[in-house]
Interface confidence: medium
């Protein structure tokens, strides 16, 4: 109970934190926190490489989809946004920025354009797109 | 610095929290936290009254839109969901569950159907709908 009181004072809360409630994060200021992952949607359109650089400059990466359960907030995302998925022409696989391979059944890949990068679209779809085309993008930071 | 160390241990963090990072909440477990407000999207379709009751049972209310800046994550919400906005036939105004009047220029109200309740749709649109029609809904809890 003491730690709850401490947290209340630390965060200028004057009420007890119910046991069913919890803090999320830590995340960069004004990012979305969900199941202890941090997300931010960026309105300005950049190509994939610029989007990746923007996320990296904020100590984050482009969106990585790793779990439909832990990331079910992504179901309801409107429009199309760069994520950290790229096509490796040599072996035909899709992999994330960290080098891990796209797990089966996580995303439905739809070939809308010519390209080696992927846009995230609602309901866990990946739309293939030319990496040099400007699009909005999603950065993600996984908390430790 | 001590409080950061304390928080690290409390949240099983083994790294320092950068000064630019912060915790969000508190929120009910597995809710979305953004700018210290808590949101949850519910998939099951209920009429407006059932949706309101569902939110209340979780110590929350149906979505209240009060600021485009503080709630800009709502821009990217796909589909249509009940929010806590109702039409008062006696004076023709739209008001929130807490009795406050809808501020001008916050929502674009679109008359899709005859009704006294409103669905939230992306980019700060409100669609008038019959309150007895089942729809998905958004609950919101404002932290103190």
């Amino acid at each position: 109970i003491w730690s709850a009181v401490f947290l209340n004072s630390l965060f200028n809360q004057e009420v007890q934190i119910p046991l069913t409630e919890s803090y999320c994060g830590p995340c960069p200021k004004n990012w979305i926190c969900y199941k202890n992952n941090c997300y931010q949607f960026f309105n300005e359109s950049k190509n994939w490489y610029e989007s990746q650089a923007s996320c990296m400059s904020q100590n984050a990466s482009l969106l990585k989809v790793y779990s439909k359960e832990d990331q079910d907030l992504l179901k309801l995302v409107k429009s199309y946004h760069w994520m950290g998925l790229v096509h490796i022409p040599t072996n035909g696989s899709w992999q994330w920025e960290d080098g891990s391979i796209l797990s089966p059944n996580l995303l439905t890949i739809i070939e809308m354009q010519k390209g080696d990068c992927a846009l995230y679209a609602s309901s866990f779809k990946g739309y293939i797109e030319n990496c040099s085309i400007p699009n909005t993008y999603i950065c993600m930071q996984r908390t430790v | 610095i001590w409080s950061a160390v304390f928080l690290n241990s409390l949240f099983n963090q083994e790294v320092q929290i950068p000064l630019t990072e912060s915790y969000c909440g508190p929120c009910p477990k597995n809710w979305i936290c953004y700018k210290n407000n808590c949101y949850q999207f519910f998939n099951e379709s209920k009429n407006w009254y059932e949706s309101q009751a569902s939110c209340m049972s979780q110590n929350a209310s149906l979505l209240k839109v009060y600021s485009k800046e503080d709630q800009d994550l709502l821009k990217l919400v796909k589909s249509y969901h009940w929010m806590g906005l109702v039409h008062i036939p006696t004076n023709g105004s739209w008001q929130w569950e807490d009795g406050s009047i809808l501020s001008p220029n916050l929502l674009t109200i679109i008359e899709m159907q005859k009704g006294d309740c409103a669905l939230y749709a992306s980019s700060f649109k409100g669609y008038i709908e019959n309150c007895s029609i089942p729809n998905t809904y958004i609950c919101m809890q404002r932290t103190v």
Partner: antibody, heavy 123, light 107 residues
Framework: QVTLKESGPTLVKPTQTLTLTCTFS??????????VGWIRQPPGKALEWLAL???????RYSPSLESRLTITKDTSKNQVVLTMTNMDPVDTATYYC???????????????WGQGTMVTVSS | QSVLTQPPSVSVSPGQTASITCSGD??????VSWYQQKPGQSPVLVIY???KRPSGIPERFSGSNSGNTATLTISGTQTVDEADYYC??????????FGTGTKVTVL
């Protein structure tokens, strides 16, 4: 063999809501990658895409008409329904539904079209 | 919103080659489909993904796409090819976009 057929009113009054039904056969709208779209064509004019619904109930709308359109599906009945509110004489057109080609193959093409239904908006 | 521009009409003699162009910003970066529509009939897909022909479409129909222009070519044009032709592409802002349409007349 994939077939689609549109049905609905031939005459609608201005400000009314149009409801069109596309009944299809030869495929299932629960199969991954499948989609059904609506396209219209005013007399003597070009085709205009309106909306599309995917197998997983994900919906896409023409940005210029999004506020007026709703697309839904009934997988058990093999039907897709399009509603368009606040009809205006400029919405007079032939309305087609079409099958979107399968996953990762010609993702942007509509390979099979219905016969179309002519809708006139007039008072 | 994206705009795909086509010439309003193209005339060709039987047996000759008809070329229909479709212009749009960086169109070569996108996949283009082509549809044929005869009077009073529904559109029929004749080319998808720039160059591919659905089954049942004659070999005289071919497509190409680079730069800002996609082209539908009808080699050895026949009178049955007289129709309106529409190009179509997709992008993440306008989604599915159709061209302005070209009327092909076989003289």
């Amino acid at each position: 063999q994939v077939t689609l057929k549109e049905s609905g009113p031939t005459l609608v009054k201005p400000t009314q809501t149009l409801t069109l039904t596309c009944t299809f056969s030869g495929f299932s709208l629960s199969t991954s990658g499948v989609g059904v779209g609506w396209i219209r064509q005013p007399p003597g004019k070009a085709l205009e895409w309106l909306a599309l619904i995917y197998w997983d109930d994900d919906k896409r709308y023409s940005p210029s008409l999004e506020s007026r359109l709703t697309i839904t599906k009934d997988t058990s009945k093999n039907q897709v329904v399009l509603t368009m509110t606040n009809m205006d004489p400029v919405d007079t057109a032939t309305y087609y539904c079409a099958h979107r080609t399968g996953i990762a193959v010609a993702g942007i093409a509509f390979d099979i079209w219905g016969q179309g239904t002519m809708v006139t908006v007039s008072s | 919103q994206s705009v795909l521009t086509q010439p309003p009409s193209v005339s060709v003699s039987p047996g000759q080659t008809a070329s229909i162009t479709c212009s749009g910003d960086k169109l070569g970066d996108k996949y283009v489909s082509w549809y044929q529509q005869k009077p009073g009939q529904s559109p029929v897909l004749v080319i998808y993904q720039d160059t591919k022909r659905p089954s049942g479409i004659p070999e005289r129909f071919s497509g190409s796409n680079s730069g800002n222009t996609a082209t539908l070519t009808i080699s050895g044009t026949q009178t049955v090819d007289e129709a309106d032709y529409y190009c179509q592409a997709w992008d993440s802002s306008s989604l599915y976009v159709f061209g302005t349409g070209t009327k092909v007349t076989v003289l």
